[in-house]
Structure formats: C-alpha cells, structure tokens
Interface confidence: medium
C-alpha cells in the first residue's frame, strides 16, 4: 500500500502550503502526515506520489482510462490510466439562485466562485432541477385564409415540471367583456393535439382547423400551467371571402 | 514560455478595460497551470490582485478590487482575462500576469510563488 513508502511524519519537512490557501479546503496527503489542498473534479487523487492528495469532501476517487487531455499531467506524460476525483451525486441540484447545477459539486464550486467575488453562497434547495414556472418559446401565428381551408395553429412552451397546454377560444359579447371557450369543445371541424419536445421540459401543441369556417374566426389563445405559474399567447383566425383580400404586407406576421 | 499582456491604455475614471495575457511556447500546457494577475505602480511594491485554478472552475480576489474585476480564462486560447470595472486613479499601474504550474485546485499570491511572468501592459487612469 502507498503507506508502505511513508516515513516517519516530520510536519517541518511538509511544503508550505500556498499563501491564500486551497479553494476546497485542506486534506492530508496520501501518508496521512502533510496538509495538502484538497483535490477538486477532474484532478488526480490518490497513489503514494507526492502531492497526490485526497479529493474534496462530497468526491470519490475513481481510477480513469483515459489521460487526462491538455490539462496537468499531460504534458508530463502521466500513466495510461489516472484516479482522478469525481462527485459522489451525479445527479443535478437545485441552487438557492434558481439555477440547475449537473451536480452538486458544481453547485459548490459556483458557490465558491460567487463568494470569491463578494456574492451571497449558493447553496442546495433541492435534489432534481430548479422549478420554474411556463414560459412560451413560440406563440402562435395570426392566419389569414378563405373558408374551406385547412389551417392550424401551434405554440410550444417550456416549463418544470412540464406544463400542460390548453387551448382557449377568446370571445368578447357586444359590451365587450370577454369569455373563454375551452377547445375542442363539440367543434367538429376543430382538433387539438398536443406532443411532448422538442426539448426536454416543452410541450408543443397545435389547433386544426378544417374546413375553415367563418365562425372559426377570432382569438384563439395557447394557455401553459405548471405548479409554478402560468403563461399564454394568442393569435387570430381571419376568414376572407377571397385569396385577395388577404393582406401580403411584409413584416405583418400574418401567414396563409 | 512567452506570456504577453495587451488591452491596456489611457481611460477615464469610471470607465473599464479588459486585458489579456495569452500564452506561448513548446511544450507548454497552459491548462496545467494557475494564472494570476499583479500590478506595480511607481514607488510601491507589486501588488497582487486576483487569481485563477488551472481549470478555470475557482477564482480569488483581493479587496482592491473585489466587486469590479473578473479574471477568466479560455484554455482553448491559451489567454487569461482581467476585465476592470469602474476604473479609479489609484489603479494608474504596470499590469503583469503570471503563471504557476498547479496541478491542483489551489490559489497562488506571492511574487516568488509564480514561475513565468509577462512584460506588462500600462494602464492609466485619468481623472
């Protein structure tokens, strides 16, 4: 074992340490006699060598295949095969910032980071990503088009967890106050569907229309709604009597 | 191995400046090595002002500027960064960058500590 190598312990032999210390604190070295600075992902641990030292607390040192490419070692030409410190929890954390760390020992290191910088610590909410409340990534386009056409509509949210998409027809009566109509409703003409993606935490939903009446007309509105909030977007169906009454001016938003 | 400030010049209090130190020569792995930032003004001892691991993942900084620099580095570049904020009279000084092989996590603020030094790059600030 590497302890087979070690000597007597004489700490005034140890080198000195750097000035302002190590960023993930001290540890000894592999003879459990001089203090050395903890070792964080990716660096090498482990072994009898001088300064292979003992990886950070919340690491484990893993032997690794591959060399470790362009970083220290590489150029010394290091053994084929490298214990490096990995972090124990593979798994992504939640940070008190809201933002989602791979794991939580990068959610320590930007801890670190933000301190350095005079900034409040960051520290685990919880396992699992940061909960966040719907947004939409593409709203819906307006339409214009001639009865009997087949038209749709789609608007693609992302949220966590994972919204639910609904889709409103906006009505207003004559004294202008607005009601919502649920769809499908009894439509027959009208069909919703919704999929999961294209990334992960979005959900796509479209509105079919076909054959295109002139009730269908109107304000049609995509509505998210996760455990964190909720957010919607709406657009217009126009129906012309004529492919010409529909308006091609550029920059319009309107498509056919 | 070549270490080679650039970025600085004349600008006025409260303005910023981003300076760069990138480095050169064979068999140097810049990604094997911690990089720290100095300044030396006339008449005072060089002073250290921020430091940076090896990977990039930790940073330090020292009160003088602490809130108003970042040290950042782009290994596939071989170049470390100072951006400074808020500039004040006071930071009038010759900026070095150094480097010290490191194949650790560790922070690095005396003179003597660091191995490679740069030429410097002149920074002004006029009020």
């Known amino acids: 074992s590497s302890s087979d190598a070690c000597g007597p312990c004489v700490p005034a032999s140890c080198p000195a340490l750097p000035r302002l210390g190590c960023p993930l604190g001290e540890t000894r070295d592999a003879c459990g006699c001089c203090p050395v600075c903890a070792r964080g992902e990716g660096e090498p641990c482990g072994g009898g060598a001088a300064g292979r030292g003992h990886c950070a607390p919340g690491m484990e040192c893993v032997k690794s295949r591959k060399r470790r490419k362009g970083k220290a070692g590489a150029a010394a030409g290091g053994p084929a095969t490298l214990a490096v410190c990995v972090c124990k929890s593979r798994y992504p954390v939640c940070g008190s910032n809201g933002i989602t760390y791979p794991s939580g020992c990068q959610l320590r290191a930007a801890s670190l980071r933000a301190e350095s910088r005079g900034e409040k610590a960051i520290t685990q909410v919880s396992k699992g990503t940061c909960e966040q409340g719907p947004s939409i990534v593409t709203p819906p386009k307006d339409i214009w088009n001639v009865t009997g056409a087949k038209v749709f509509l789609s608007c693609e949210v992302i949220g966590i967890p994972t919204p639910v998409l609904i889709w409103n027809k906006v009505k207003r009566d004559h004294s202008g106050v607005q009601r919502t109509e649920l769809l499908p409703g009894d439509r027959e003409n009208l069909a919703i569907q919704t999929r999961g993606g294209p990334e992960k935490h979005e959900v796509t939903g479209w509105v079919l229309v076909s054959p295109l009446s002139k009730e269908d007309a109107g304000e049609y509105e995509c509505h998210a709604s996760n455990s964190q909030g909720q957010a919607s977007a709406a657009a217009k169906i126009t129906v012309v009597d004529a492919l010409h009454e529909i308006p091609l001016k550029k920059g319009e938003g309107a498509q056919l | 191995v070549q270490l080679q400030e650039s970025g600085g010049g004349l600008v006025q209090t409260g303005g910023s400046l981003r300076l760069s130190c990138a480095a050169s020569g064979r068999s140097f792995t810049f990604s094997s090595y911690a990089m720290g930032w100095f300044r030396h003004a006339p008449g005072k001892e060089r002073e250290f002002l921020t430091a940076i691991t090896w990977s990039g993942d930790y940073t330090y900084y020292t009160d003088s500027v602490k809130g108003r620099s970042t040290i950042s580095r782009d290994n596939a570049k071989n170049t470390v960064y100072l951006q400074l904020n808020n500039l004040k009279p006071e930071d009038t000084a010759v900026y070095y960058c150094?480097?010290?092989?490191?194949?650790?996590?560790?922070?690095?603020?005396?003179?003597?500590?660091?191995?490679?030094w740069g030429q410097g790059t002149q920074v002004t600030v006029s009020s």
């Open positions: 150094a480097a010290k092989f490191s194949q650790v996590s560790a922070f690095f603020a005396t003179v003597s500590e660091y191995e490679y």
